[in-house]
């Protein structure tokens, strides 16, 4: 069927397919300093890491395009790691008034797939 | 702000950055001859093409992606190019009584963003 | 281990000040938001403000701006709650709460100060 | 009164499932996680469920959350008489930030 299961072990090896990691940046690092008061370091999970043919398959697009990445390499790119889905952030920052606190919904990954 | 405006027009040259490209497939690419009877070939709608700084950005997380992909490009991957939607697609295929109508709503992308 | 300790139970008289203290230990007390809850008698939690023991910075929910101070001192990891002229509506236990990691939830409470005030 | 809706009270036997639920806008629950605090007899609250459907370490299996739309739900299964407390959701709201739940009073009958 169309929506086959999503392959789910690594065929390259530990840690090398598409997963989610934590790097750690300052207000500096993102050029936020000017309006982002706190906190003054974020720890974004990021999605990273290889996809291979059929691994976390968002859907049926990509899957057609990890099938036709086989065929076509030079003409079809191979599915890539991106977020599936977001945790809410929320950041003190200035505002004319001096302070508010405001939530961000889609700033740090909470879990990725290849689409 | 966080939410700056994804910047529209590519800095690589014409055709070289993400975005919608029309692939050419017929069933027995995609393997699913024995069980899709019609349409026999389909024209898929496939994001490609790169993501250079700020073009095109999903979203806050794209941004910050793209900004510490260039402070520490090692560690942190370029946000790539991928569907921001879907067109349906109806096809018709083979079922135990017969044959039948069904539409797939993520099969062939519609736009694509940089995420 | 992370503990957020409360200073004792206090009994006020209408008009008086007083300063309320909250302190943090087992976790780094710069790199978490502190925020205040109070509870009247016999019914729920009410959230009244946050502060960024960091930068000192502070935002008061609309209900409490102006009635109370919310300041915090790095160098002994302590938060403090403090009113310059308390009311008899004022009493309530009032606890302190961590934040987590992205600012949404309060994954660590102090065991809550008790302040009674009356005539 | 609260921004968001819980009943006051809700009971069960030993072993039973209940749910308490939580009813907000799409100014909170709506669009960001749901929170859920457990505060026993005399005691500070504790957290219980986080971004929705998270439990932290040491809280057991049989609490478990979820949400959908504007409204959440806190289940607890096997329940045991420990369980008799004050149940809070918590969520932000743009207008007035964190915001609570008026609380729901679980009672374990028998």
């Known amino acids: 069927s169309a929506h086959a299961h999503p392959r789910d072990s690594c065929p390259l090896g530990p840690g090398r397919c598409c997963h989610l990691e934590t790097v750690q940046a300052t207000l500096e690092d993102l050029g936020w300093s000017d309006w982002v008061l706190s906190p003054r370091q974020l720890q974004l999970s990021m999605c990273v890491g290889e996809c291979p043919h059929l691994y976390r398959s968002a859907n049926t697009h990509a899957q057609i395009k990890a099938r036709l990445h086989g065929l076509q390499p030079d003409k079809v790119p191979a599915p890539c790691c991106v977020p599936s889905s977001y945790t809410p952030v929320v950041l003190m920052h200035r505002t004319d008034s001096g302070v508010s606190l405001q939530t961000y919904d889609d700033l740090v990954a909470r879990g990725c797939h290849c689409a | 702000s966080a939410h700056a405006h994804p910047r529209d027009s590519c800095p690589l040259g014409p055709g070289r950055c993400c975005h919608l490209e029309t692939v050419q497939a017929t069933l027995e690419d995609l393997g699913w001859s024995d069980w899709v009877l019609s349409p026999r070939q389909l024209q898929l709608s496939m994001c490609v093409g790169e993501c250079p700084h700020l073009y095109r950005s999903a979203n806050t997380h794209a941004q910050i992606k793209a900004r510490l992909h260039g402070l520490q490009p090692d560690k942190v991957p370029a946000p790539c190019c991928v569907p921001s939607s879907y067109t349906p697609v109806v096809l018709m295929h083979r079922t135990d009584s017969g044959v039948s109508l069904q539409t797939y709503d993520d099969l062939v992308a519609r736009g694509c963003h940089c995420a | 281990e992370v503990q957020l300790v409360q200073s004792g139970a206090e009994v006020k008289k209408p008009g008086e000040s007083l300063k309320i203290s909250c302190k943090g230990s087992g976790y780094s007390f710069t790199s978490y938001w502190i925020g205040w809850v109070r509870q009247m008698p016999g019914k729920g939690l009410e959230w009244m403000g946050v502060i960024d023991p960091d930068g000192s910075y502070t935002i008061y929910s609309p209900s409490f701006q102006g009635q109370v101070t919310i300041s915090a001192d790095k160098s002994i990891s302590t938060a403090y709650l403090q009113w310059s002229s308390l009311k008899a509506s004022d009493t309530a236990m009032y606890y302190c709460?961590?934040?987590?990691?992205?600012?949404?939830?309060?994954?660590?409470w102090g065991q809550g100060t008790l302040v009674t005030v009356s005539s | 009164q609260s921004v968001l809706t819980q009943p006051p009270s809700v009971s069960g036997a030993p072993g039973q499932r209940v749910t308490i639920s939580c009813s907000g806008s799409s100014s909170n629950i709506g669009v960001l996680y749901v929170n859920w605090y457990q505060q026993l007899p005399g005691t500070a609250p504790k957290l219980l469920i986080y971004s929705n459907d998270n439990r932290p370490s040491g809280v057991p299996d049989r609490f478990s959350g979820s949400k959908s739309g504007t409204s959440a739900s806190l289940a607890i299964t096997g329940l045991q008489a420990e369980d008799e407390a004050d149940y809070y959701c918590q969520s932000w709201d743009s207008s007035s930030n964190y915001v609570f739940g008026g609380g729901t009073k679980l009672t374990v009958l028998g």
């Open positions: 709460a961590r934040y987590g990691r992205y600012g949404t939830y309060f994954d660590y």
